[in-house]
Amino acid sequence: CKAMHVAQPAVVLASSRGIASFVCEYASPGKATEVRVTVLRQADSQVTEVCAATYMMGNELTFLDDSICTGTSSGNQVNLTIQGLRAMDTGLYICKVELMYPPPYYLGIGNGTQIYVIDPEPCPDSDF
């Protein structure tokens, strides 16, 4: 296993609809044809997997059908979008990138993106 640098933004604010997008960029040391991207959430010293996708260079990211994540790739950049976020989902979202094929296997883990989610205020009742 060889190390690889992964960069991601420090902070992202989710939209009022609970959608957050950020770019995960990795410094590929070779010409990988298969890449696996995993988003991890760290909160209260616990790390959980949010979603994962495998893709071929030049192809779309393959998330499972029930995933809350979508994404696209361009070169060594992955544009990730996480949907359905609520205030309780605020936390550090870490991008993990693995170059799966061809060998050698490379692994890179970003420093994390702090995603802030603010639940929208309910609309006040109207007399009109």
Epitope: M56, N59, E60, T62, L64, M100, Y101
Partner: nanobody, 113 residues
Framework: QVQLVESGGGLVQPGGSLTLSCAAS????????MAWYRQAPGKEREVVAG????????NYGDSVKGRFTISRDNAKNTVYLQMNSLKPEDTAVYYC??????WGQGTQVTVSS
């Protein structure tokens, strides 16, 4: 158990065509990006073509663009590689791939007059 079984390889003359098939079983085929790789004697294995789960996105190695077409039938758990205008340099063992987990055993394609 997981199986990827390739078929359709053989001997063909330059300029000819072949269609390779890969029948998958033992895993959820529609959840995987699928691909074809090839390996010529004395060379590294290289990507030929890839196709997304739905079949909506495809990509090709530079040397086969415009000549090869990858497709899939999720109802039949099968991925195909239509190869046209074959050249001697296309001679190789062709492998089916469920990205990034499983490999087929390969099928030989020989382009020669």
């Amino acid at each position: 158990q997981v199986q990827l079984v390739e078929s359709g390889g053989g001997l063909v003359q330059p300029g000819g065509s072949l269609t390779l098939s890969c029948a998958a079983s033992g895993f959820t085929f529609s959840s995987y990006t699928m691909a074809w790789y090839r390996q010529a004697p004395g060379k590294e294995r290289e990507v030929v073509a890839g196709i997304s789960r739905s079949g909506g996105t495809t990509n090709y190695g530079d040397s086969v663009k415009g000549r090869f077409t990858i497709s899939r039938d999720n109802a039949k758990n099968t991925v195909y590689l239509q190869m046209n205008s074959l050249k001697p340099e296309d001679t190789a063992v062709y492998y089916c791939r469920a990205v990034s987990d499983y490999w087929g055993q390969g099928t030989q394609v020989t382009v020669s007059s």
